[in-house]
């Protein structure tokens, strides 16, 4: 039969993953680490280190594993049920509005400001005005003091787009 697309099809169909593995679909869905076969009768395993699926699904294909970019470190490898977890290297961070690349953290705050937050893998150092305590906008300062920052350690997952 040919498949017609409806609006409700556009929302991913997912549910929480129990621990057992199955070789045939349950209620038309395959478990994490698998995708559904073309005829819908079988669940086919994803290829370890190459692709993955995280939820019960009726996907025709597993999702390609993210490969960490240069400037990133791999915190955990891709498995059949979980994507690679990448993190910006020490001294760099990834902003929410530009998640595709790691940017260098500033080494210090502009004159008249004091550092209140360290460089982490997901944020630049945070500077506030000494007097008012208001945050600095994040623009690159013309003059920097020699206040160095220490990078943070928590992990942030890579974006799914790879």
């Amino acid at each position: 039969e040919s498949a017609l697309i409806t609006q409700q099809d556009l929302a991913p169909q997912q549910r929480a993953a129990p621990q057992q593995k199955r070789s045939s679909p349950s209620e038309g869905l395959c478990p994490p680490g698998h995708h559904i076969s073309e005829d819908g009768r079988d669940c086919i395993s994803c290829k370890y280190g190459q692709d993955y699926s995280t939820h019960w699904n009726d996907l025709l294909f597993c999702l390609r594993c993210t490969r960490c970019d240069s400037g990133e470190v791999e915190l955990s490898p891709c498995t059949t049920t979980r994507n690679t977890v990448c993190q910006c290297e020490e001294g760099t961070f990834r902003e929410e509005d530009s998640p595709e690349m790691c940017r260098k953290c500033r080494t210090g705050c502009p004159r008249g400001m004091v550092k209140v937050g360290d460089c982490t893998p997901w944020s630049d150092i945070e500077c506030v005005h000494k007097e008012s305590g208001t945050k600095h906008s994040g623009e690159v300062p013309a003059v920097e003091e020699t206040v160095t920052s220490s990078p943070g350690t928590p992990a942030s997952p890579c974006s799914l787009s790879g």
Epitope: D9, G28, H35, E38, G40, D51, L60, S161
Partner: nanobody, 125 residues
Framework: EVQLLESGGGLVQPGGSLRLSCAAS????????MSWFRQAPGKGLEFVSA????????YYADSVKGRFTISRDNSKNTLYLQMNSLRAEDTAVYYC??????????????????WGQGTLVTVSS
């Protein structure tokens, strides 16, 4: 972010062949599954064929199985659909799409997916 441009459509006689291309620009689509849909005049959107990111797992609708072949060249960022033994009922606008994956019913899956503008295939004598 990603632009998909189909080409290769045209008028062909029943039994004839056409090869459609879908060129991606803006960023590489080698991480994405890709597919072909079609819409016949006055009909809904039909899922025709799909191919995974690596090009080694395919899907075909029953209506085109054995006649159409989907393939991709990741080095050229291009998807193809070789259509043989064309029939009048294959007349439609053909669209390509890219997504992280596609559900069995054809719905694109993932945070981002992209569609082309379509190319018209007319099968008529």
């Amino acid at each position: 972010e990603v632009q998909l441009l189909e080409s290769g459509g045209g008028l062909v006689q029943p039994g004839g062949s056409l090869r459609l291309s879908c060129a991606a620009s803006g960023r590489t689509v080698s991480n994405y599954a890709m597919s072909w849909f079609r819409q016949a005049p006055g009909k809904g959107l039909e899922f025709v064929s799909a191919l995974n990111w690596g090009g080694d797992t395919t899907y075909y609708a029953d209506s085109v199985k054995g006649r159409f072949t989907i393939s991709r060249d990741n080095s050229k960022n291009t998807l193809y659909l070789q259509m043989n033994s064309l029939r009048a009922e294959d007349t439609a606008v053909y669209y390509c799409a890219a997504a992280q994956s596609f559900r069995r019913g054809g719905a694109p899956y993932g945070d981002n997916y992209w569609w082309g503008q379509g190319t018209l295939v007319t099968v008529s004598s």
